[in-house]
């Protein structure tokens, strides 16, 4: 009989937690140093040896007395039924074709876990099993009592299973869902007796592959690889996850310490191409992602350093910096951004090897700026470095604009009192901190006579007492560097307050729209003047300079309030810089109803009439232009007298109303009355918006027609 190479010393052990049978065996009859390919046929039966549930051919290379191993994972927990294993072998090697036949079967090796379960009346398996959602799971109960009827529940819902034998029932769960972080509850209970037995099926969410796998280098020495791990298992006790990086060109492998990044030392042998496999693994499965790249194409430079802003003048500055080298021949592209008032105002790209330099021009004097620089690989752009930022302030320059100057001229005891006003220069015009204002008085009647007044900032005006001569006044603003151009205004011996007819203007939401006639002679411009707080001693004088070709403007201000009368004066500026009054305008941004009523006197009382008169009262203080008056007359008469009409008052009483539509009229005769009759009257002004407040009526009784006899 030919030499039989049979499997011998077969041992079967179990791993309940993993539901695995582990087989160990060897082949004794091999010659020393002989190595043959063999195939082993393995049969597994359940409950009875005749019930074979698994057959598998396992091929491997065998040496004499080598311990061979094979494992099988059971869908059914091993505690649910007795399992038996046997095997046979055959040579499957071209060296010895004559040995290609099966050996005899080994005897059946029996695995019966039930015998070691203990004496409880009921068991449920598997215990604390961990599966992924969507898996199929088989569970069973083992009962020690034949009499008891046993019911099993999945999350409180009764399950229906198949009886394997009188003591064992199996349940097949399909596509198990994730329910909660503490697992899915399954329990069985006996109809009689004190028995509930439960297990927890720990269902984890599907282990996802890492996302956004990417590698880059900052110095060509170390690669930093990052990824986003998939969502967690959803269980309170987290499954341990491991991450491994494998690089196929070098054949090197590293176990990553962290769950979302890993460092890799770049080979000193100038390896350029890298082919990485990132493998994520947990108890249940492995996931792999791949990345192939050229090292020089994945350079993320470090931020520029030694960054300085030098040679800062009023309008220029130079930025210098150094870059970290990324190889002998590489060029970096650097981007410079200049910020003013939080906005990018200049952007420039510069190529750099080691040292970078950039001149920033057209800057504003005495202004705060921020300049920042970042760099990237110029040949193979991957990522910009972080920004390095420096703040600087440009130097001051002389103010660029003349101050905007105006004046108010009053005649006091034969002198001219001139109040000068000027507006502070804007930041852009001042070019630095204004320290003082110079006011130069030039007497035009004695041109050689100059007087200098220096007024410290932040003053915005001064008062001058001048004789009746003509003066030219020069005002300049000064900072640490120099002087602004001069603003010139002239004052003549004649105050020039000629009488001009005042014209009414109507304000709108946008302000007051003012217009004037163009002047026939030479004018260098116009000035519109007004008070923002009329009636206030301080007045808050405002003015607006306009060009010589302008004949209208809109004056708007947040200070304009409803019911306040604003007076505007329009001046022409002669070629000698002397202002002269052209027009006066007056109006309300919004008219209101009158705030009070005039005091009314009654006279000339007769049996048939009486006369009313009232004083003119300050129009300036009225919250609107008075357009006329309403006179209300109450009497017992059923009909209103001629010239009046019926009116209903706010208290619903009825009376007669006379409309006086001439605002200048200050007397009114009430006629056609009845002798010995009782009357009441009340007078109120009205504006375009409405009448004044309703006040008390004055009582009057006409005498009878014979009372004078």
């Amino acid at each position: 009989e030919p030499l039989s190479l049979a499997p011998e010393s077969l041992e079967v052990s179990i791993d309940s937690a993993r539901q695995c049978l582990h087989l160990k065996w060897s082949v004794h009859n091999l010659a020393y140093h002989q190595e043959l390919k063999m195939v082993f046929q393995i049969e597994i039966s359940r409950i009875k040896t005749s019930n074979v549930i698994w057959v598998e051919n396992y091929s491997t290379t065998v040496k004499r007395n080598q311990v061979l191993r094979w494992s099988w994972e059971s869908k059914l927990p091993l505690e649910c039924a007795k399992h038996s294993v046997r095997m046979r072998g055959a040579v499957d090697d071209a060296q010895v074709p004559e040995l290609r036949f099966w050996s005899n079967w080994t005897s059946w090796e029996e695995v019966d876990v039930q015998s070691s379960l203990g004496h409880d009346p009921l068991f449920v398996f598997p215990k604390d099993k961990l599966v992924e959602e969507g898996s199929n799971v088989t569970i069973c109960y083992v009962s020690r009592s034949h009499q008891n009827n046993i019911s099993c529940y999945l999350e409180g819902v009764r399950m229906h299973g198949e009886q394997l034998d009188p003591n064992v029932c199996v349940f097949h769960l399909k596509n198990v869902p994730f329910i909660r972080e503490t697992g899915t509850n399954i329990y069985c209970k006996a109809d009689q007796g004190d028995v509930i037995k439960g297990i927890v099926l720990f269902v984890s969410k599907v282990f996802e592959e890492p996302k956004d796998f990417s590698c880059e280098t900052r110095d060509l020495k170390t690669l930093n690889c990052t990824w986003a791990p998939g969502s967690d298992a959803g269980l309170l006790t987290q499954l341990s996850q491991s991450y491994t990086l494998f690089e196929s060109f070098s054949g090197k492998k590293t176990l990553c310490k962290y769950k979302s990044w890993c460092n890799w030392q770049v080979s000193p042998d100038s390896q350029e191409m890298y082919n990485f496999t990132l493998t994520a693994e947990n108890y249940l499965r492995k996931r792999s992602v791949h990345l192939l790249f050229n090292l020089t194409h994945r350079v993320h430079p470090m931020a520029p350093f030694n960054v300085f802003v030098k040679n800062v003048s009023a309008t220029n500055a130079t930025m210098t910096w150094k870059v970290h080298s990324i190889g002998n021949y590489s060029t970096l592209l650097c981007q410079i951004e200049l910020y003013g008032e939080g906005k990018v105002i200049q952007k420039q790209n510069v190529s750099v090897k080691v040292n970078g330099k950039h001149l920033m021009k057209k800057l504003e004097p005495s202004t705060e700026y921020a300049a920042q620089v970042r760099c990237a690989n110029a040949n193979h752009f991957w990522k910009w470095s972080e920004w390095t930022r420096r703040n600087f302030t440009t130097a001051e320059a002389a103010p660029s604009e003349a101050p905007d100057v105006w004046r108010n001229v009053k005649s006091v005891q034969g002198h001219c009192v001139v109040t000068l006003f000027w507006k502070p220069l804007s930041k852009l015009q001042a070019n630095g901190k204004i320290l003082f204002y110079n006011v130069v008085l030039e007497n035009l009647d004695r041109p050689s006579t100059l007087k200098l007044l220096s007024i410290p900032a932040p003053a915005n005006g001064t008062e001058l007492t001048l004789d009746r001569c003509s003066y030219q006044i020069h005002v300049t603003a000064n900072n640490s560097v120099g002087t602004s151009p001069a603003s010139v205004i002239a004052v003549s011996g004649d105050p020039g307050n000629k009488e001009v007819e005042e014209e009414r203007v109507k304000g709108t939401e946008d302000g007051f729209c003012l217009s004037w006639k163009p002047q026939p002679g030479d004018v260098t411009g116009y000035v519109v003047e007004w008070c923002e707080r009329p009636g206030d001693p301080l007045c808050d004088l405002q003015w607006k300079n306009l060009g010589p070709n302008t004949t209208s403007t809109v004056v708007s201000s947040d200070a304009f309030r409803p019911g306040v009368r604003y007076n505007f004066r329009i001046y022409g500026i002669s070629t000698e810089r002397i202002p002269y009054l052209l027009e006066k305008k007056t109006g309300y941004s919004q008219e209101l109803v009158p705030s009070d009523n005039p005091q009314v006197l009654m006279s000339n009382l007769t049996s048939y009439s009486f006369t009313l008169s009232w004083k003119d009262y300050a129009a300036e203080s009225q919250p609107g232009f008075v357009q006329g008056y309403s006179l209300y007359l109450k009497s017992k008469a059923a009909r209103c007298l001629p010239g009046s009409e019926k009116a209903v008052l706010s208290d619903d009483s009825i009376c007669c109303k006379y409309k006086i539509d001439n605002p200048k009229q200050k007397t009114f005769v009430v006629e056609n009355l009845q002798p010995a009759s009782f009357y009441e009257f009340f007078l109120t002004p009205y504006t375009s918006v409405g009448e004044g407040p309703q006040g008390a009526f004055t009582k009057v009784t006409t005498p009878d027609e014979y009372s004078h006899i």
Epitope: D128, E181, T182, I196, T237
Partner: antibody
Framework: DVQLVESGGDLVKPGGSLRLTCVAS????????MSWVRQAPGKGLQWVAY????????YYADTVKGRFTISRDNAKNTLYLQMNSLKTEDTATYYC???????????WGQGTLVTVSS | EIQMTQSPSSLSASPGDRVTITCRAS??????LNWYQQKPGKVPKLLIY???TLHSGVPSRFSGSGSGTDFTLTISSLEPEDAATYYC?????????FGQGTKVEIK
């Protein structure tokens, strides 16, 4: 018959430590998850900690997390609760409980009193 | 954490009365609602688990019902030995939490 016997309760100062022990008998201990539940004097019940049958899954109430450790020795049929950094509010009777269904406390020991006081 | 609110906090009833105790969870607990009985000086005992399943050895006069967040323990005919404090408890979401208890006295 199912029996759970706790021991180890004592008077201890705040900041001190204690180890409670629960010995199980009358059933296959390794098949069951176990919990500790406590009851302060004159107060209601509060779950403290849970351990699965194989000891792989452990949960704690937030009030004891980081201070208490639950463990089991299936060979000795014993459940433990190591209590460190004890506070006065940990004063209670501690019950060892068998969980046939997770979060369901079917069988209770007679309890052991822990008093934390200075 | 899920709050369990029992009402009433105490009640007094005569033997033979029908007694109802309610328990409300602050969120859905998937019917993982258990009821326990604790007599003075004694250890708590499981009466009902999974909302309505009677634990072995518990008299049939005890019953449980409800779903979602509202649950009820009913004693159909009160016996003198039912004097005790009754606790509801949810086992769905960690931390597992108990109601504050309902004390039942016999008149």
């Amino acid at each position: 018959d199912v029996q759970l016997v706790e021991s180890g309760g004592d008077l201890v100062k705040p900041g001190g430590s204690l180890r409670l022990t629960c010995v199980a008998s009358g059933f296959t201990y390794s098949s069951y998850a176990m919990s500790w539940v406590r009851q302060a004097p004159g107060k209601g019940l509060q779950w403290v900690a849970y351990i699965s049958s194989g000891g792989d899954y452990i949960y704690y109430a937030d009030t004891v997390k980081g201070r208490f450790t639950i463990s089991r020795d299936n060979a000795k049929n014993t459940l433990y609760l190591q209590m460190n950094s004890l506070k006065t509010e940990d004063t209670a009777t501690y019950y060892c409980v068998r969980d046939p269904i997770t979060g369901t406390f079917a069988y209770w020991g007679q309890g052991t009193l822990v008093t934390v006081s200075s | 954490e899920i709050q369990m609110t029992q009402s009433p906090s105490s009640l007094s009833a005569s033997p033979g009365d029908r007694v109802t105790i309610t328990c409300r969870a602050s969120q859905d607990i998937n019917n993982y609602l258990n009821w326990y009985q604790q007599k003075p000086g004694k250890v708590p005992k499981l009466l009902i688990y999974y909302t309505s399943t009677l634990h072995s050895g518990v008299p049939s006069r005890f019953s449980g019902s409800g779903s979602g967040t509202d649950f009820t323990l009913t004693i159909s005919s009160l016996e003198p030995e039912d004097a005790a404090t009754y606790y509801c408890q949810q086992g769905n979401t960690l931390p597992w939490t108990f109601g504050q208890g309902t004390k039942v006295e016999i008149k």
